[in-house]
Interface confidence: low
């Protein structure tokens, strides 16, 4: 399927609107510090060039690869060296090294100001004045803050963003209509970014075959009626889509994702009975819907797994003939029977099975050796089950905020070298898993909880990778795709940690805390809690609770005072002194 001009091919396939949006996302994800106007200018230049290629595919430069065209365009930015430093060196390289170089300089935690939401009327005016610029700005701001955001999905978010403004800016109570929708988009967007971050990290760190294993397990759970060959085809296509998006090839990625959605809908009879509604939707909604579709019912008459994978005398023969295919079939058969297991657990079981066959197929009596392999699965299954049971009990007892605090203390004691903002961000997210997953019945808890935990612990890994400070975090993040969570769970208190010097400034608060939202106030308190644990890692739960209760009472008292600032100054000193005494700092 060779095209004379790749850029013309993608422009025609995607249409001008999607083409421009995707090029803007690509550029903003690469050059995260560049002003909006500069990006718009670059996108317009690329779009005009693409149109000349559509008119005549033989025109000059139209035969160049997209990486060459986009890279050349990025390298025209005059301030590249002063804004991005050594990233400018990428421009001296040839493709494909140049694109690899740009990818390596993507910053998961860019130094950008927090997005502040303007007044509703201000936003509605901006939306009405120039809808196109308003929506482009949304794409730009999200893309530069989330350099691995799944680009075709960001188009879907932008469509919903536009719909929210179109509806709510005409409503009687604009704020009541708009703000909940924007909150929902923000929260879903963060979750979507984190999920895609894990996919890209898996591809990057562990390779395509590891990603394929993940996809076999997930798609087999979702489409248990589909044949193995069908699942394999979907896995291959899905891997291509995500490899492209994670590699910055956003036009190809969006195009291939649309093709995959089309294929799935044309073949839904042999894939899943749950796809009908999704397949009636327009393209962006359709792709999103398929990605989120519920698991189909399991076929009623599935035979026991033991016959083919333990009982048969041909196990070693089948394994030796085509290892990947045989293990893939094992994973497919196991996953379709176990929608109640997390994907990472299924991969652990497959790994155990693989290791056993490697050992046993070289033994004198292979069958005798691997006959009990399924018994080895029991502890692997029980570990996440017990962990989830304990943590959901704790969550139900404490509620989200206090559950987050318990996790903050737990993780700060495990890895106290990690920066306080990272510990707060990650522990808050881990705590939200409680709200999201503990409400589910037992059969849905593990896939919800453990796969969510994998996503948020990957966030910790990605943030830590930027400035590594803890060997224990590095170990849990790099040793294995599927054992990251158990590795973190198994960490005990870090006895080698030298407590941080006490700094009164860290615990000095001002009247501005009173005007913060409930969420921001919680973050302030949780930041203080992490700092306390870093000063006093041996503090007991009771000691920490007492100090935090005093702190909450102090904030409440001073926020009610007439002279708030004086109250914070004077009462704050007393609180610090009392806390030092309580914790023996």
């Amino acid at each position: 399927d060779a095209h004379k001009s790749e850029v013309a091919h993608r422009f025609k396939d995607l249409g001008e609107e999607n083409f421009k949006a995707l090029v803007l996302i690509a550029f903003a994800q690469y050059l995260q510090q560049c002003p909006f106007e500069d990006h718009v200018k670059l996108v317009n230049e690329v779009t005009e060039f693409a149109k000349t290629c559509v008119a005549d595919e033989s025109a000059e430069n139209c035969d160049k690869s997209l990486h060459t065209l986009f890279g050349d365009k990025l390298c025209t930015v005059a301030t590249l060296r002063e804004t991005y430093g050594e990233m400018a060196d990428c421009c001296a390289k040839q493709e494909p090294e140049r694109n690899e170089c740009f990818l390596q300089h993507k910053d998961d935690n860019p130094n950008l100001p927090r997005l502040v939401r303007p007044e509703v009327d201000v936003m509605c005016t901006a939306f009405h004045d120039n809808e196109e610029t308003f929506l482009k700005k949304y794409l730009y701001e999200i893309a530069r803050r989330h350099p691995y955001f799944y680009a075709p999905e960001l188009l879907f978010f932008a469509k919903r963003y536009k719909a929210a403004f179109t509806e709510c800016c005409q409503a009687a109570d604009k704020a009541a209509c708009l703000l909940p929708k924007l909150d929902e988009l923000r929260d879903e967007g963060k979750a979507s970014s984190a999920k895609q971050g894990l996919k890209c990290a898996s591809l990057q760190k562990f390779g395509e075959r590891a990603f394929k294993a993940w996809a076999v397990a997930r798609l087999s759970q979702r489409f248990p009626k589909a044949e193995f060959a069908e699942v394999s085809k979907l896995v291959t296509d899905l891997t291509k889509v995500h490899t492209e998006c994670c590699h910055g090839d956003l036009l190809e990625c969006a195009d291939d994702r649309a093709d995959l959605a089309k294929y799935i809908c044309e073949n839904q009879d042999s894939i899943s009975s749950k796809l009908k509604e999704c397949c009636e939707k327009p393209l962006l909604e359709k792709s999103h819907c398929i990605a989120e579709v519920e698991n189909d019912e399991m076929p009623a008459d599935l035979p026991s797994l033991a016959a083919d994978f333990v009982g048969s005398k041909d196990v070693c023969k089948n394994y030796a003939e085509a290892k990947d295919v045989f293990l893939g079939m094992f994973l497919y058969e196991y996953a379709r029977r176990h929608p109640d297991y997390s994907v990472v657990l299924l991969l652990r079981l497959a790994k155990t099975y693989e290791t056993t066959l490697e050992k046993c197929c070289a033994a004198a009596d292979p069958h005798e050796c691997y006959a009990k392999v399924f018994d080895e699965f029991k502890p692997l299954v029980e570990e996440p089950q017990n962990l989830i049971k304990q943590n959901c009990e704790l969550f139900e007892q404490l509620g989200e905020y206090k559950f987050q605090n318990a996790l903050l203390v737990r993780y700060t004691k495990k890895v106290p070298q990690v920066s306080t903002p990272t510990l707060v961000e990650v522990s808050r997210n881990l705590g939200k898993v409680g709200s999201k997953c503990c409400k589910h019945p037992e059969a849905k808890r593990m896939p919800c909880a453990e796969d969510c935990l994998s996503v948020f612990l990957n966030q910790l890994c990605v943030l830590h990778e930027k400035t590594p400070v803890s060997d224990r975090v590095t170990k849990c993040c790099t040793e294995s795709l599927v054992n990251g969570r158990p590795c973190f769970s198994a960490l005990e208190v870090d006895e080698t940690y030298v407590p941080k010097e006490f700094n009164a400034e860290t615990f000095t608060f001002h009247a501005d805390i009173c005007t913060l939202s409930e969420k921001e106030r919680q973050i302030k308190k949780q930041t203080a809690l992490v700092e306390l644990v870093k000063h006093k890692p041996k503090a007991t739960k009771e000691q920490l609770k007492a100090v935090m209760d005093d702190f909450a009472a102090f904030v409440e008292k001073c926020c009610k005072a007439d002279d708030k600032e004086t109250c914070f100054a004077e009462e704050g000193k007393k609180l610090v002194a009392a806390s030092q005494a309580a914790l023996g700092l």
Epitope: G207, E208, R209, K351, E354, T355, L481, V482, N483
Partner: nanobody
């Protein structure tokens, strides 16, 4: 079919350097982790070094750490081992090995071996 062909071995004096190459064919090279394993005369197999599919993760046996460097060129389907400061105890048959561990976690799974290239370190 899968083929791994090593080259670059030979006779070298202690303290000198050698670079081994392994040309891979018959499979998608960049999907697999690769390793070097050696066997000294009359001894068992000894793992030397491994490299992940994209070169991000590299590990060495303690006996060669700081002296040997493993690398790969996925565009050329080639694996390399740069051996510096060679010693008599590095004398061995060096094998290029494919790692088929599907999930690239934990222990490697060696499923295809080359014929080996002989390195002799002697004055």
């Amino acid at each position: 079919e899968v083929q791994l062909v090593e080259s670059g071995g030979g006779l070298v004096q202690p303290g000198r350097s050698l670079r081994l190459s392994c040309a891979a064919s018959g499979f998608t090279f960049h999907h697999y982790a690769m390793h070097w394993v050696r066997q000294a005369p009359g001894k068992g197999l000894e793992w030397v070094s491994g490299i992940s599919w994209n070169g991000n993760k590299i590990t060495y046996a303690d006996s060669v750490k700081g002296r040997f460097t493993i690398s790969r060129d996925n565009a050329k389907n080639s694996l390399y081992l740069q051996m510096n400061s060679l010693r008599a105890e590095d004398t061995a048959l060096y094998y290029c090995v494919r790692d088929s561990s599907l999930f690239i976690v934990g222990a490697p799974t060696f499923d295809h071996w080359g014929q080996g290239t002989l390195v002799t370190v002697s004055s």
